[in-house]
């Protein structure tokens, strides 16, 4: 089999509040009922895990309570939102999708979404 294809947008600009959203879509070779989605950040060849969630098809994604990610799923599409981003978090955010159950296991890795984060300028002090 070929690698499971995972598609995601090439570039996303975070909002002024440090929130970025993007869609991660995968071409499922089978009828998966349990899916694991992991967001990885790659910068200067260093890779770190941002967040991960396992969900049952048709159910909501459940991230850990302290996660900076939230998301929803619809079919073979996952809508991901990352919050609390700052300029130093700019980087390539890669969507990794694993079809956990039923067997066989499939793994697909997207080419990444370059998220640009610009810290807002502080408001000037008022003279009033």
């Amino acid at each position: 089999c070929k690698a499971m294809h995972v598609a995601q947008p090439a570039v996303v600009l975070a909002s002024s509040r440090g929130i970025a959203s993007f869609v991660c879509e995968y071409a499922s070779p089978g009828k998966a009922t349990e899916v694991r989605v992991t967001v990885l950040r790659q910068a200067d060849s260093q890779v770190t895990e941002v967040c991960a969630a396992t969900y049952m098809m048709g159910n909501e994604l459940t991230f850990l309570d302290d996660s900076i990610c939230t998301g929803t799923s619809s079919g073979n599409q996952v809508n991901l939102t990352i919050q609390g981003l700052r300029a130093m978090d700019t980087g390539l955010y890669i969507c990794k999708v694993e079809l956990m159950y039923p067997p066989p296991y499939y793994l697909g890795i997207g080419n990444g979404t370059q998220i640009y984060v610009i810290d807002p300028e502080p408001c000037p002090d008022s003279d009033f």
Partner: nanobody
Framework: EVQLVESGGGLVQPGGSLRLSCAAS????????IGWFRQAPGKEREMVSC????????KYADSVKGRFTISRDNSKNTVYLQMNSLRAEDTAVYYC???????????????????WGQGTRVTVSS
Amino acid sequence: EVQLVESGGGLVQPGGSLRLSCAASGFSSDYYDIGWFRQAPGKEREMVSCIRSSGGSTKYADSVKGRFTISRDNSKNTVYLQMNSLRAEDTAVYYCGLAPISPVHAVCNQHYFGYWGQGTRVTVSS
């Protein structure tokens, strides 16, 4: 279905050598990372060595540099790990892993691996 089958493990004396083989099947992409990982009792799985299918970039753990050599035979879809000057601390179960990456991904990063073989045990003892 992706299958990775390891062989070549066994019992060897300190200072000895072993050659591990990993035969990959069921995966038709010509771009991937494939490598060797090991897990000693009570420890986490760690990368030993890895090679990129296209271009042949390699990576080694500091603890095995100069002693272990990874190579591949793309015509046989097989990767080899030549292990020389073996030490007691090399004792572990050795796993073959595959990462279905593309050129944008960092070479041989453990986060990208997901396909695993069953493992082959290597014991270094006198």
